[in-house]
């Protein structure tokens, strides 16, 4: 069908991983498909097996090297092909010229920890994971705090427009359980998107001293 519902989307984590999702309505769940990576100026080729993630979509990770190795640069073009088995042969379903630093999605921030907590305030820090040194300080963050009786979707977003791997949360309620998440995005890249949210960090504010508010 013309204007079919196929979709092939990939992101580079800025170091040694390209994650891809292939979706095609009407495809059988047990269809065997792969992603092949063919760089324009590198000696390696790489393949990953697409595995089902929902009724009509499959995903895989092209592992290009050790997690912190810098395998691609802004001048690279990697041609990515979706190949699916049809009977005894492999058939190309989609093909894409992929500019890695135009299609970035970093790994979720890690190592969240409470640096200091008070009755109304909490200082939290985190680290970025597997992020290229090319970015220097050209990163931004979004953070959100889950308050009792609310959902993550209701939590207001706090934007940090610089590479700042800490935040001081204020106007918190004493003796109250909260959760905190953060995500990161490079400023570079036309199709770049936010990282997944970090694992939530649970913390509790200190109780107010007796006789004080």
């Amino acid at each position: 069908a013309v204007n079919g519902t196929s979709r092939f989307t990939c992101f580079y984590n800025s170091r040694a991983n390209i994650s891809c999702v292939w979706s095609q309505d009407g495809a059988l769940q047990d269809t065997s498909c792969q992603v092949h990576a063919w760089p324009d100026r590198r000696r390696w080729n790489q393949t990953c097996e697409l595995l089902p993630v929902s009724q009509a979509s499959w995903a895989c990770n092209l592992i290009l090297g050790t997690p912190d190795s810098q395998k691609l640069t802004a001048v690279d073009i990697v041609t990515l092909r979706v190949m699916c088995r049809e009977g005894v042969r492999w058939r190309m379903m989609a093909i894409q010229d992929f500019k890695p630093f135009e299609n970035l999605r970093l790994m979720a921030p890690i190592s969240l920890q409470v640096v200091h907590v008070e009755t109304h305030r909490c200082n939290i820090s985190w680290k970025i994971s597997q992020a290229s040194h090319y970015f220097e300080r050209h990163l931004e963050f979004e953070a959100r705090t889950l308050s009792p009786g609310h959902t993550w979707e209701e939590a207001p977003l706090m934007t940090l427009k610089q590479k700042q791997e800490w935040i001081c949360l204020e106007t918190l309620t004493p003796d109250t359980q909260y959760e905190f998440q953060v995500r990161v995005k490079p400023l570079q890249g036309e199709f770049t998107t936010w990282s997944p949210w970090s694992q939530p960090l649970a913390f509790r504010t200190k109780p107010a001293a007796l006789g004080k508010d």
């Epitope: 079919g4 095609q24 073009i77 041609t79 058939r91 894409q96 010229d97 036309e190």
Partner: nanobody, 124 residues
């Protein structure tokens, strides 16, 4: 949205060759996948070939693989379809099409804009 104008169609004998051209106007051409489709009388429009924005990657329908070659010249904002060993069943109106900016090229097509088409007739 790019504007597309096809040319190069005509009448040719079986076994002959034709080269279709598709001239695109628009600043996004060099980052769009491009396609050729065809439609024979009384039949649905069908995928013929596709090419990625840099020209590194190509995709063909089984019926034309090895006979047709898609290529592009981003400096000239033009995509081509070289058709060799033509057969009577290649007779159709041939349409150039552009996919979304920065997207992949698909066997089933994801199309943003279409040309008006050029007629190819292969006589036996």
């Amino acid at each position: 949205e790019v504007q597309l104008v096809e040319s190069g169609g005509g009448l040719v004998q079986a076994g002959g060759s034709l080269r279709l051209s598709c001239a695109a106007s628009g600043s996004t051409f060099s980052r769009q996948p491009m396609y050729w489709f065809r439609q024979a009388p009384g039949k649905e429009r069908e995928f013929v070939a596709a090419i990625t924005w840099s020209g590194r990657g190509t995709l063909y329908a089984d019926s034309v693989e090895g006979r047709f070659t898609i290529s592009r010249d981003n400096a000239k904002n033009t995509v081509y379809l070289q058709m060799n060993s033509l057969r009577p069943d290649d007779t159709a109106a041939y349409y150039c099409a552009a996919g979304p900016y920065g997207d992949a090229a698909y066997r089933h097509g994801r199309i943003d804009s279409w040309g008006q088409g050029t007629q190819v007739t292969v006589s036996s």
